[in-house]
């Protein structure tokens, strides 16, 4: 599933994070 | 519209154990973290620990270990964090936030808070 | 653990006038591989929930308005607030999300 968390493991934060994921949030659609 | 709705306030004897929800609508409730921050009356904000619900990992700070405990049922898209032993140092309000999972990891959406009273 | 120090602890300003806060992380918030500092900032009203208003050090949140910036890198930040609004009265706050996350003591903001 494009641009979702969905194999994304659970991080303690950003400073390990490889890449920026951007789960499709729909409430920020305007 | 995202919102997190949270339980009415607590009143609580201490040495038990109390139990609170968060319930998640208006997204996706497995996409995002659920982090629980803790504010003592006129103090600042401490952050206690989070769950990604979708597989139930957890993070703690440290000082909240044994403390708190938290859970989330996907069913209902709900999360909890239940406080152990309470003693008058555990009195506060306690907020859950959504955190923006994998981008920001910012904290993007707020729950009203639920204010726990320890007494007897 | 990651410590994060606010200054001042509290300012009051007349409204109009420019307000800088700071925020010192004990160690670095920058991940080299996303190039993004993993540093919010979080506005506290009297009586209300914590309101984000900037993530990533520097990149509003819809709806914050304009007045508000953020910036720094590494591990010293700012949060300036260029004309300050009587509805500015509040706490701010300064967060990591590097590891885990920590939050700053706070800054109080009063209008004159």
């Known amino acids: 599933k494009i641009g979702s968390t969905e194999n994304l493991k659970h991080q303690p934060g950003g400073g390990k994070v490889q890449i920026v994921y951007k789960p499709v949030d729909l409430s920020k659609v305007t | 519209q995202v919102q997190l709705q949270q339980s009415g306030p607590e009143l609580v004897k201490p040495g038990t154990s109390v139990k609170m929800p968060c319930k998640a609508s208006?997204?996706?409730?497995?996409?995002?973290?659920i982090s629980w921050v803790k504010q003592r009356t006129g103090q600042g904000l401490e952050w206690i620990g989070e769950?990604?619900?979708?597989?139930?990992?957890?993070y703690y700070n440290e000082k909240f270990k044994g403390k708190a405990t938290l859970t989330a049922d996907k069913s209902s898209n709900t999360a909890y964090m239940q406080l152990s032993s309470v003693t008058s140092e555990d009195s506060a309000v306690y907020f859950c936030?959504?955190?923006?999972?994998?981008?920001?990891?910012?904290?993007?959406?707020w729950g009203q808070g639920t204010s726990v009273t320890v007494s007897s | 653990d990651i410590v994060m120090s606010q200054s001042p602890s509290s300012l009051a300003v007349s409204a109009g006038e420019k307000v800088t806060m700071s925020c010192k992380s004990s160690?670095?918030?920058?991940?080299?591989?996303?190039?993004?500092?993993?540093l919010a900032w979080y506005q506290q009203k009297p009586g209300q929930s914590p309101k984000l208003l900037i993530y990533?050090?520097?990149t509003r949140e819809s709806g914050v308005p304009d007045r508000f910036t953020g910036s720094g890198s590494g591990t010293d930040f700012t949060l300036t607030i260029s004309s300050v609004q009587a509805e500015d009265l509040a706490v701010y706050y300064c967060?990591?999300?590097?590891?885990?996350?920590?939050f700053g003591g706070g800054t109080k903001l009063d209008i004159k």
């Open positions: 967060k990591q999300s590097f590891y885990l996350r920590t």
């Open positions: 936030a959504r955190d923006y999972y994998g981008t920001s990891f910012a904290m993007d959406y």
């Open positions: 160690q670095s918030l920058l991940n080299s591989r996303t190039r993004k500092n993993y």
């Open positions: 208006g997204y996706i409730f497995t996409d995002y973290v």
């Open positions: 769950i990604f619900p979708r597989s139930g990992s957890t």
């Open positions: 990533w050090a520097s």
